[in-house]
Interface confidence: medium
């Protein structure tokens, strides 16, 4: 997190806000609900209280405007700048302005007013942008999904550094951004994508360029807004320029940033029995056109060329790949070796000699 220079903050805990005007995109009650919910994000974790005024001067004046709207910080038409807010202080201090050239919504379409407002009110209270891609105060808008919003830990630490904690946090679970060098780090899925490596963990993935040590961290939804926050397994089919992503009983085919029509499909359409609830890991072999799909202590082999499950499967993981354990969290193949991830450990398995050749920490893939 980051606070503004000179640690700008309000010197009182009871703050007022006023909605000066409304966007035509939403009903008045939807707008009011979005702003109330956005203030609650911050009051839930601090001693701050927010009261709405219907007229007069409030600490935080909220308005919608376009282009030059009276503060010498003009908006720029659709997309680009969405909104801005002033840090705590008199006059403009704390005020939040929203660009009415955007389409404001209470859903994933256009820009979600609650999410943008919660971010802007962070500025109104004294938080600057964060470098943590998981933080609400990260400067890039990402719709985080329909489920109940949880304020990330980085933002909680930031706002409590200014105002301290509240009496009781109604939602004490604040998602932390994974630390790639945490020795207990386990991974959810790994796939190549157009020469890069994508390493998935929780609602994030690390993007590793070849010959590069520093992996970039992204929210999965910043790449693929339609995907679930978390995924179970992934593999690339390079000759078709596709990657396949699995979550629960569904899977998606993606070409770059775009989901193919007809997806998601059910994993049962691949020939998996109905009792398989999820795929835990998947890896594709371009030379044979086969894909291994792991679930529980079993492995299936799918023929991507003929679109059928191979006979004699499922088989036990321990029988086909002795020594790697009875589950696989994530897997990928490179230069004749399969890398199996099981908890905080990865096994380098030689396809040629059919045995484990190295055991390493899972996060050594991230150069830790």
């Amino acid at each position: 997190y980051n606070v503004f220079p000179r640690t700008l903050k309000w010197s009182k805990m009871n703050l007022t806000y006023r909605i000066v005007n409304y966007t035509p995109d939403m009903t008045h009650s939807e707008v009011e609900k979005a702003f109330k919910k956005a203030f609650k994000v911050w009051s839930d974790v601090t001693p701050l209280n927010f009261t709405r005024l219907h007229d007069g001067i409030a600490d935080i004046m909220i308005s919608f405007g376009i282009k030059e709207h009276g503060d010498f910080y003009p908006f720029d038409g659709p997309s680009g700048l969405l909104a801005h807010a002033f840090p705590p202080g008199p006059n403009y201090g704390g005020d939040a302005h929203f660009d009415d050239d955007e389409t404001w919504t209470s859903s994933s379409k256009g820009y979600n007013l609650f999410l943008v407002a919660a971010h802007e009110f962070g500025h109104s209270l004294g938080l600057d942008h964060s470098k943590d891609p998981g933080a609400l105060m990260f400067p890039i808008y990402t719709y985080t999904g329909k489920s109940h919003f949880m304020l990330p830990d980085d933002d909680v630490q930031g706002i409590q550094s200014l105002y301290g904690p509240g009496d009781e946090d109604p939602n004490p679970k604040h998602p932390k951004t994974p630390d790639k060098c945490d020795p207990s780090l386990s991974l959810d899925a790994i796939t190549s994508l157009r020469g890069e490596t994508m390493i998935f963990k929780d609602r994030f993935f690390w993007r590793l360029h070849p010959q590069q040590v520093d992996a970039e961290l992204f929210l999965t939804k910043s790449f693929w807004p339609e995907l679930p926050n978390r995924i179970d397994a992934a593999y690339e089919h390079p000759s078709h320029d596709l990657i396949f992503i699995f979550r629960g009983r569904k899977f998606w085919a993606l070409n770059g940033y775009d989901i193919l029509e007809g997806y998601p499909k059910k994993i049962s359409e691949l020939g998996l029995p109905k009792e398989v609830k999820k795929i835990s890991a998947a890896v594709h072999f371009e030379d044979t056109g086969k894909t291994l799909l792991f679930s529980g202590n079993q492995v299936w082999r799918y023929d991507d060329t003929n679109h059928i499950m191979d006979k004699d499967y499922p088989r036990l993981i321990e029988e086909d790949f002795p020594g790697i354990g009875d589950k696989v969290d994530a897997v990928y193949e490179k230069n004749g070796y399969i890398y199996f991830f099981n908890g905080p450990i990865q096994f380098e398995y030689s396809i040629w000699s059919n045995r484990i050749v190295r055991v390493m920490p899972a996060n050594s893939i991230l150069w830790c």
Epitope: P78, S79, S222, D241, N255, Y257, D258, L260
Partner: nanobody
Framework: EVQLVESGGGSVQPGGSLRLSCAAS????????MNWYRQAPGKQREFVAG???????NYAVSVRGRFTISRDNSEGTGYLQMNSLRPEDTAVYYC????????WGLGTLVTVSS
């Protein structure tokens, strides 16, 4: 419906630069990812670079560090700045919006030779 028209192709010597443009008609361009693909004579069409709606970029390994993709939603235009061109970059370059099942331009020829 989005129509795409590429321009900016031509002949250039190795080490030279070109800037390809992709003009989109239709106001929905900003709702789609924008990609460049290329096809060399006798070869399969291959991905070159992509930029998401949220302006996240992605490059083929062979062009990373030399090519830069960008977009201007207000103008409805996408760009591919190609520097340090090599003979193996010779191909017809196609603009795409929305991925393999999306919209395609007719292509513009880039020739790199001495």
């Amino acid at each position: 419906e989005v129509q795409l028209v590429e321009s900016g192709g031509g002949s250039v010597q190795p080490g030279g630069s070109l800037r390809l443009s992709c003009a989109a008609s239709g106001s929905t361009f900003s709702r789609y990812s924008m990609n460049w693909y290329r096809q060399a004579p006798g070869k399969q069409r291959e991905f070159v670079a992509g930029i998401s709606v949220g302006r996240i970029t992605n490059y083929a390994v062979s062009v990373r560090g030399r090519f830069t993709i960008s977009r201007d939603n207000s103008e409805g235009t996408g760009y591919l700045q190609m520097n340090s061109l090599r003979p193996e970059d010779t191909a017809v370059y196609y603009c795409n919006a929305g991925g393999l099942q999306g919209y395609w331009g007719l292509g513009t020829l880039v020739t790199v030779s001495s």
